[in-house]
């Protein structure tokens, strides 16, 4: 779901699932801004004190990243300018499951949306012909 209104921008997330031990994607899009330096992306997680990830002024800002996500997160930096705030999560762990918030600040305003992320050992269904 997203939020909108005065001094707000629309942020949209999609619930997703990650396979333990593999890389996962937490999807988030927002109304783009014309200047990359005006965009701040923050990912937060329920139950975690620090940030999952922060991207501002065109680069990752790691000082407030929570230790449980250190070295495991990245945004698609070249796609931020077109409104893609999705997070790549490396080496998905069982404890990564939970409620995440994608929080965006641009020159147009602020917005955020929650995302439920499930983790497990999923496999592609076999189709017998």
């Amino acid at each position: 779901f997203g939020i909108s209104g005065r001094h707000s921008i629309t942020v949209t997330t999609v619930a997703s699932a990650g396979n333990i031990g593999e890389d996962g994607i937490l999807s988030c899009t927002f109304e783009p801004d014309i200047k990359l330096s005006d965009i701040v992306i923050q990912w937060l997680k329920e139950g975690v004190l620090g940030l999952v990830h922060e991207f501002k002024e065109g680069k990752d800002e790691l000082s407030e990243q929570d230790e449980m996500f250190r070295g495991r997160t990245a945004v698609f930096a070249d796609q931020v300018i077109v409104g893609n705030a999705s997070l790549r999560l490396k080496n998905v762990q069982l404890t990564d499951a939970g409620t995440y918030k994608c929080y965006i600040i641009t020159s147009k305003g602020k917005g955020n949306a929650n995302l439920e992320y499930k983790t497990g050992a999923f496999s592609m269904p076999e189709v017998n012909v």
């Epitope: 975690v48 004190l49 620090g50 407030e64 230790e67 250190r70």
Partner: antibody, heavy 116, light 113 residues
């Protein structure tokens, strides 16, 4: 600019509780954790704990577990630190700060004196 | 939990001379994932909150004079004031932010000789 304004000095009796407030402005309150640190007279800095305001997730130092409660009110951009069962050793200046790791911005401090 | 130990506890240096403060962590604060040391230095003057001077062990906070520098990696770190000024009289703390609980050194008091 980032500002953290704390409530005024308190004098408390042993066994009682104190609740210190910290009003944040100049940044997005829900984006960053608020940390609480204390400093006894003439002593060093001691981490008490912190809170993620958007989800209300709090973490406490083991030493204070069961005696401290850190909360945050998103509507007023205010964080609170309540310490119960006060003893004389809790006499200290209590600081709130923006962030949970690297602390660039601090409140002015609140002196809590515990005396009978 | 990580324990931070500073030396010396106090230091008297003549104006214009070099002051050196050491900080040792009980375990490494160097992250292999980004090759950064999660170590900061703060200055505290009487009646004031601490002020951030250095982070990532060697990056100066904006507005901090270049006479302040930080060095070291892993478990051993140093804060150097290259030419002590009267306004540098204060207590200096190192802090690890590699993991919670956050831990500070016990502080080093710098005075003028």
């Amino acid at each position: 600019q980032v500002q953290l304004v704390q409530s005024g000095a308190e004098v408390k009796k042993p066994g009682s509780s104190v609740k210190v407030s910290c009003k944040a402005s100049g940044y997005s309150f829900i984006s960053y954790a608020i940390t609480w640190v204390r400093q006894a007279p003439g002593q060093g800095l001691e981490w008490i704990g912190g809170i993620n305001p958007i989800f209300g997730t709090a973490k406490y130092a083991q030493k204070f577990q069961g005696r401290v409660t850190i909360t945050a009110d998103e509507s007023t951009s205010t964080a609170y630190m309540e310490l119960s069962s006060l003893r004389s050793e809790d006499t200290a200046v209590y600081y709130c700060a923006k962030g949970q790791a690297l602390i660039q911005h601090w409140g002015q401090g609140t002196l809590v004196t515990v005396s009978s | 939990d990580i324990v931070m130990t500073q030396s010396p506890d106090s230091l008297a240096v003549s104006l214009g001379e070099r002051a050196t403060i050491n900080c040792k962590s009980s375990q490494s604060v160097l992250s292999s994932s980004n090759n950064k040391n999660y170590l900061a230095w703060y200055q505290q003057k009487p009646g004031q909150p601490p002020k951030l001077l250095i982070y990532w062990a060697s990056t100066r906070e904006s507005g901090v004079p270049d006479r302040f520098s930080g060095s070291g990696s892993g478990t051993d770190f140093t804060l150097t004031i290259s030419s002590l000024q009267a306004e540098d009289v204060a207590v200096y703390y190192c802090q690890q932010y590699y993991s919670t609980p956050l831990a500070f050194g016990q502080g080093t008091k710098v005075e003028i000789k």
